[in-house]
């Protein structure tokens, strides 16, 4: 009976996500067979989050809307380890929008999920950000510095990275 009710709960939870994510990839968390964490297929997972590299080129606002439709946001990078994971899936000759912007042009950078902007955990390329007109952040590769962040005009289409919390069933 217990197993039956657990299965029913899982199925109803899966149905919630089905319209956006028809297929989930799930792994068992820890030793308890009861707990599974899932990411939409073909998203990648790191710690408690799922990531999707969107190769369509869109403006920052359209990229964020695109992530939002999938139940995600443009990526918020909280640690060096997280960035190191993300860059494994990026192409060196491309740029990708982050969920970081300065809409007022006053260098008050803000993350889309309201995570406080911490100057000590940022990975700007040297000399960046450098232009008050450029109010959105990308991550890109520079041969001298490897991967880092740069400020660019928000309306210029780029690829993007979406991030969502893992689905626990």
């Amino acid at each position: 009976n217990f197993m039956y009710s657990k299965t029913v709960k899982r199925l109803s939870k899966l149905r919630e996500y089905q319209q956006y994510h028809p297929s989930l990839t799930c792994v068992m968390e820890g030793k308890d067979i009861e707990d599974w964490s899932c990411c939409p297929t073909p998203w990648t997972s790191f710690q408690s989050s799922c990531y999707f590299i969107s190769t369509g080129m869109q403006s920052w606002t359209k990229s964020q809307k695109n992530c939002s439709v999938m139940g995600a946001d443009l990526v918020v990078i909280n640690t060096r380890e997280e960035q190191d994971f993300i860059i494994q899936n990026l192409k060196r000759n491309s740029s990708y929008f982050l969920g970081l912007s300065d809409p007022g042009g006053r260098r008050h950078w803000q993350w889309v999920d309201q995570t406080p902007y911490n100057e000590n955990v940022t990975f700007w390329h040297s000399g960046e950000p450098n232009n008050l007109d450029e109010r959105c952040a990308i991550i890109n590769f520079r041969s001298s510095e490897e991967w880092g962040w740069n400020d660019i005009h928000c309306h210029v289409p780029q690829k993007s990275i979406c991030k969502m919390k893992k689905i626990y069933i």
Epitope: G104, G105, N131, D133, R135, H155
Partner: antibody, heavy 121, light 111 residues
Framework: EVQLLESGGGLVQPGGSLRLSCAAS????????MSWVRQAPGKGLEWVAT????????YYPDSVKGRFTISRDNSKNTLYLQMNSLRAEDTAVYYC??????????????WGQGTTVTVSS | DIVMTQSPDSLAVSLGERATINCKAS??????????VNWYQQKPGQPPKLLIY???NLESGVPDRFSGSGSGTDFTLTISSLQAEDVAVYYC?????????FGGGTKVEIK
């Protein structure tokens, strides 16, 4: 008073080249993103190119990408548009304009009087 | 590309009467409460002049008989009381995503 003065237009044969200039005064030119917009005779407006204040980022529509190059010399307060492989459909009045951000978008707030480019054999 | 479609192509209005110009975007140009549509006025032989930005914000120095409204995909420029000096072509433009695109223009004349 902001002034933008375009020059360099003229008659050129198809396949030829032309370099337009836009001399700016009354603004701190080096802090402005700048754009070129064109208008074919009797037609509407078409965005042609944008360059950021430092000159390290440039943007173009597909219609001119690979043929036109926007550049700037902040020491001379001057914006340029190098136009190569010109076609009859590039015939237009070319305006330079200052770019002002508006949250995630922008406006073109000051415009020059324009310079005429005619591509014809 | 985002297509901006203006209507009507031309408009004849009596002096002192209201003129209304419509602009439809092929997709939403809104984000976070702002609409990225601008309106420009172009008089014969002159460059365009910015009138309205962000769909409804009046540019400094522009008479307040001009107003803009709308959101999403549908936008309107209104001249509440047409003056002789308002004879011009009016263009909408979106700045949400490159390439920036303009409407085809609406010619406003006096009836």
């Amino acid at each position: 008073e902001v002034q933008l003065l375009e020059s360099g237009g003229g008659l050129v044969q198809p396949g030829g080249s032309l370099r337009l200039s836009c001399a700016a005064s009354g603004i701190t030119f080096s802090t402005y993103t700048m754009s070129w917009v064109r208008q074919a005779p009797g037609k509407g407006l078409e965005w042609v190119a944008t360059i950021n204040s430092g000159g390290d980022n440039t943007y173009y529509p597909d219609s001119v990408k690979g043929r036109f190059t926007i550049s700037r010399d902040n020491s001379k307060n001057t914006l340029y548009l190098q136009m190569n492989s010109l076609r009859a459909e590039d015939t237009a009045v070319y305006y330079c304009a200052t770019y002002r951000p508006y949250y995630y978008g922008s406006v073109l707030d000051y415009w020059g009087q324009g310079t005429t480019v005619t591509v014809s054999s | 590309d985002i297509v901006m479609t203006q209507s009507p192509d031309s408009l004849a209005v009596s002096l002192g009467e209201r003129a209304t110009i419509n602009c439809k975007a092929s997709q939403s140009v809104d984000y976070d409460g702002n609409s990225y549509v601008n309106w420009y006025q172009q008089k014969p032989g002159q460059p365009p002049k910015l009138l309205i930005y962000g769909a409804s914000n009046l540019e400094s120095g522009v008479p307040d008989r001009f107003s803009g409204s709308g959101s999403g995909t549908d936008f309107t420029l209104t001249i509440s009381s047409l003056q002789a000096e308002d004879v011009a072509v009016y263009y909408c433009q979106q700045s949400d995503e490159d390439p920036w695109t303009f409407g085809g223009g609406t010619k406003v004349e006096i009836k």
